[in-house]
C-alpha cells in the first residue's frame, strides 16, 4: 500500500517537476531588467534562453530570437544543453515510470521487472532534477557575475558630460520555476527509488538442510529463515495494490497530463 | 478610419476643474495607451502622462502629479482628462494621442482649447 | 528630466533644397535590448495636431514621403529633408520616448526662404 502511494506520488511530482522545466526552458524571462535604483524607462528588458524581448510602455512587445549559433556565449550554449538533456531525461523517466507503475498492469510483467524500471525511472529523474538545478544555477551566477560589472562600469567612466545607462539585468520568474522544478524532480526521483526498494522481491526461503553430524543424529533445520538485503519489508506474500487508496481510474489518469510533453 | 475626436472648447475660472474627453473609433480602444500633451500658445509640447484603458494603468509627469487625473471608459470608447486647481498658465491647447511602436504618439485628437480667465 | 535640444531653432531654406535639423538629448536613447534609438519625430503645421514622421529615431512612418530621413544614435540625432517643398513648412519636434516623463525639444521651425 505504501509503496504505491509512494511510486505515485514520485510520479506525480516527476510529472509536475518536468512539467515545470519545460516552461521554465521556454520561458523568455530568464533574466530581467533590473529597475532598483535606476532612471524610469518606458521600455522593460527581458531575456531568455531563446530570444531577448522588449516591452514597451505603449504596450508592444517585440522579442527577437538568437539566430546565431556561434556568436552565443558558451555559458549560455552549456544552460541550454543542461535544460533539454534534463528534459529529455525527464521525458524518458516519464515513459519509463508509467509501465513501472504497480497499479498499472501489463501483460505478466514481473515485480522485479517493475522494481528495475522504476529505480531507472527514478534515478533518470534525480539527474533530469539535477540537470535543471545546474542549468538554473549557471545561469544565475552568470546574471549576478554580469550584473556587479556593469555596476562598476555604472560608476566608472563617467567623465563626459553625456552619461549612458547601461541595461542590469537581475533574476527573471524561469529561474525560481526552473530551481522549484528541478527540486521537484528530484524529489520524485527520490521517491521513485524508495518505491523501488519496496517493489523488490528480495525474499528467498532456503530449504531444509539435514547437517549429519559423525556420531550423532542430530538435524539442524533452519527452515524459514529470512535472506534479506536490508531492502525493506518483503512483497511476495503481500498484494499492496489491492483495496489501496488510489483506483486503476485515479492513476490512469494521470498520464493524460503529460500529454504535451 | 482611426481617429480620436476631442470635446470642444472651454473657458473656466482660475481653481476651476476642467475634464476633456477624447473618443476613440476606428480600432480596439484597450489595445492601445492614451497619451495626453498640452501646448500654450505659442509655445511647444508638453507630455502631462498616459493611461492604459485596458488595465487603467497611468502614469504620469511630475509637474501634473496630483493635478491631473486620466481614466477611461472602456463601453464608450472613450478617455478623459481632468485638471484641477486651474492657473492662467493652464491656458493651452489639449491633445490626446494613441502610442504606437517606439512609445511614439500615430494618431493625434484635434485638440481642445482650453482658456482660464478670470 | 533628459533634456531635448534642438538646432536651429529657426530655419529658411530654398525649395529644393536640403534642410537639417538637429536633436541632442542629455542622456541616450539607445536601448541594449534592442538597439533601438527611441527618439520620435514629429511635424505640426500651423493650426494643426503634430503629425508623426519617424519613431526609433529612422523608422519611416507610413505615409511619410521618403524625401524625409532620419538618423543618429545614442544622443545625437538628425532629420533630413533632401529636397524642401512648399508643404514642409511647419515646426519639427523630436521627442524622448526612453524616459518618463516623455519630453519634446523646443521645435524647429522650418520656413521657404
Known amino acids: 500500500m505504501a509503496v504505491t502511494a509512494c511510486q505515485g506520488l514520485g510520479f506525480v511530482v516527476s510529472l509536475i517537476g518536468i512539467a515545470g522545466i519545460i516552461a521554465a526552458t521556454c520561458m523568455d524571462q530568464w533574466s530581467t531588467q533590473d529597475l532598483y535604483n535606476n532612471p524610469v524607462t518606458a521600455v522593460f528588458n527581458y531575456q531568455g534562453l531563446w530570444r531577448s524581448c522588449v516591452r514597451e510602455s505603449s504596450g508592444f512587445t517585440e522579442c527577437r530570437g538568437y539566430f546565431t549559433l556561434l556568436g552565443l556565449p558558451a555559458m549560455l550554449q552549456a544552460v541550454r544543453a543542461l535544460m533539454i538533456v534534463g528534459i529529455v531525461l525527464g521525458a524518458i523517466g516519464l515513459l519509463v515510470s508509467i509501465f513501472a507503475l504497480k497499479c498499472i498492469r501489463i501483460g505478466s510483467m514481473e515485480d522485479s521487472a517493475k522494481a528495475n524500471m522504476t529505480l531507472t525511472s527514478g534515478i533518470m529523474f534525480i539527474v533530469s532534477g539535477l540537470c535543471a538545478i545546474a542549468g538554473v544555477s549557471v545561469f544565475a551566477n552568470m546574471l549576478v557575475t554580469n550584473f556587479w560589472m556593469s555596476t562598476a562600469n555604472m560608476y566608472t567612466g563617467m567623465g563626459g558630460m553625456v552619461q549612458t545607462v547601461q541595461t542590469r539585468y537581475t533574476f527573471g520568474a524561469a529561474l525560481f520555476v526552473g530551481w522549484v522544478a528541478g527540486g521537484l524532480t528530484l524529489i520524485g526521483g527520490v521517491m521513485m527509488c524508495i518505491a523501488c526498494r519496496g517493489l523488490a522481491p528480495e525474499e528467498t526461503n532456503y530449504k531444509a538442510v539435514s547437517y549429519h553430524a559423525s556420531g550423532h543424529s542430530v538435524a539442524y533445520k533452519p527452515g524459514g529463515f529470512k535472506a534479506s538485503t536490508g531492502f525493506g519489508s518483503n512483497t511476495k506474500n503481500k498484494k499492496i495494490y489491492d483495496g489501496g487508496a488510489r483506483t486503476e481510474d485515479e492513476v490512469q489518469s494521470y498520464p493524460s497530463k503529460h500529454d504535451y510533453v | 478610419q482611426v481617429q480620436l475626436v476631442q470635446s470642444g472648447a472651454e473657458v473656466k475660472k482660475p481653481g476651476a476643474s476642467v475634464k476633456v474627453s477624447c473618443k476613440a473609433s476606428g480600432y480596439t480602444f484597450t489595445s492601445y495607451v492614451v497619451h495626453w500633451v498640452r501646448q500654450a500658445p505659442g509655445q511647444g509640447l508638453e507630455w502631462m502622462g498616459y493611461i492604459n484603458p485596458y488595465n487603467a494603468d497611468s502614469k504620469y509627469s511630475q509637474e501634473f502629479q496630483g493635478r491631473a487625473t486620466l481614466t477611461s471608459d472602456k463601453s464608450a470608447s472613450t478617455a478623459y482628462m481632468e485638471l484641477s486647481s486651474l492657473r492662467s498658465e493652464d491656458m493651452a491647447v489639449y491633445y490626446c494621442?494613441?502610442?504606437?511602436?517606439?512609445?511614439?504618439?500615430?494618431?493625434w485628437g484635434q485638440g481642445t482649447l482650453v482658456t482660464v480667465s478670470s | 528630466d533628459i533634456v531635448m535640444t534642438q538646432s536651429p531653432d529657426s530655419l529658411a531654406v530654398s525649395l529644393g533644397e536640403r534642410a537639417t535639423i538637429n536633436c541632442k538629448s542629455s542622456q541616450s536613447l539607445l536601448n541594449s535590448g534592442n538597439q533601438k534609438n527611441y527618439l520620435t519625430w514629429y511635424q505640426q503645421k500651423p493650426g494643426q495636431s503634430p503629425k508623426l514622421l519617424f519613431f526609433w529615431a529612422s523608422t519611416r512612418q507610413s505615409g511619410v514621403p521618403d524625401r524625409f530621413s532620419g538618423s543618429g544614435s545614442g544622443t545625437d540625432f538628425t532629420l533630413t529633408i533632401s529636397s524642401l517643398q512648399a508643404e514642409d513648412v511647419a515646426v519639427y519636434y523630436c521627442q524622448n520616448d526612453y524616459y518618463f516623463p516623455f519630453t519634446f525639444g523646443q521645435g524647429t521651425k522650418v520656413e521657404i526662404k
Open positions: 494621442s494613441r502610442s504606437y511602436y517606439g512609445n511614439s504618439f500615430d494618431v
